[in-house]
Amino acid sequence: AGHLEQPQISSTKTLSKTARLECVVSGITISATSVYWYRERPGEVIQFLVSISYDGTVRKESGIPSGKFEVDRIPETSTSTLTIHNVEKQDIATYYCALWEV
């Protein structure tokens, strides 16, 4: 079974800068899985943000504008990355990655 680790406990960024979060997949080939990213803002329910499927197809939450969140995967390091562009106060949250094993 696959296992996920998010090595960064926290990330502090200056407004308008870029934040890059990592999710390391082990126990399964990352290219054979779909990785999902979610966020939980303080006092709010968890929300889907973006996913990258086993075939590389990216899907985003329909209500979030293109160019805000960028997802990628690096097979060599078995890592999925979530890039948050133009960080602002609305981005303060806990971010989670999840795995769907195909």
């Epitope: 985003k60 329909s62 293109s66 990628d72």
Partner: antibody, heavy 118, light 108 residues
Amino acid sequence: EVQLVESGGGLVKPGGSLRLSCEASGFTFSINSMNWVRQAPGKGLEWVSSISSTSDYIFNADSVKGRFTISRDNAKNSLYLQMNSLRAEDTAVYYCVRDDVFGAFDIWGQGTMVTVSS
Amino acid sequence: EIVLTQSPGTLSLSPGERATLSCRTSQSVSRSYLGWYQQKPGQPPRLLIFGSSSRATGIPDRFSGSGSGTDFTLTISRLEPEDFAVYYCQQYSRSPLTFGGGTKVDIK
């Protein structure tokens, strides 16, 4: 039928203001992020502004920052672009555009023409 | 800002021929965030390709996209009369979202 219909374009003098509207139908407008894209006569496409479904994220091109304001009214299925301090270089067809779950711009309105001239 | 450069500016071909359009980006763009659009005179653009290689709904299979990094290509395998138009690439990986300057495919 999925449709976006823009209105509000016209002739305005430099320094003037204009408010564009876009009415959406055929899809659940309230859950989609929306955009304005413009095209100057005989030129290419230029992204202008984006707004999230709940209006918590708003992004603008540097060329319009401080002058244009994007907004939406989900109850009316409508998107707006308030354009102030208009310049000759703002002359263009303005398109209302939906971005889809894959991130690309999948639904475009027919556009409304804005002409800035004295 | 990511700058997209399309070439050639104009492509003069005959119906039935193969068209190869290039889009180069000033910074590396994940293939998931590159799209292609077709625009005919007096009409709004129409989405052809998203994610570099996936055809949008209703787009015929003579249109195909490929590429990664900074080099992307739109190929029209056999030009039909209705394919003569202007084609734009777009990156939507980060704001500001940017378009290429366009390639006009016209009849030779």
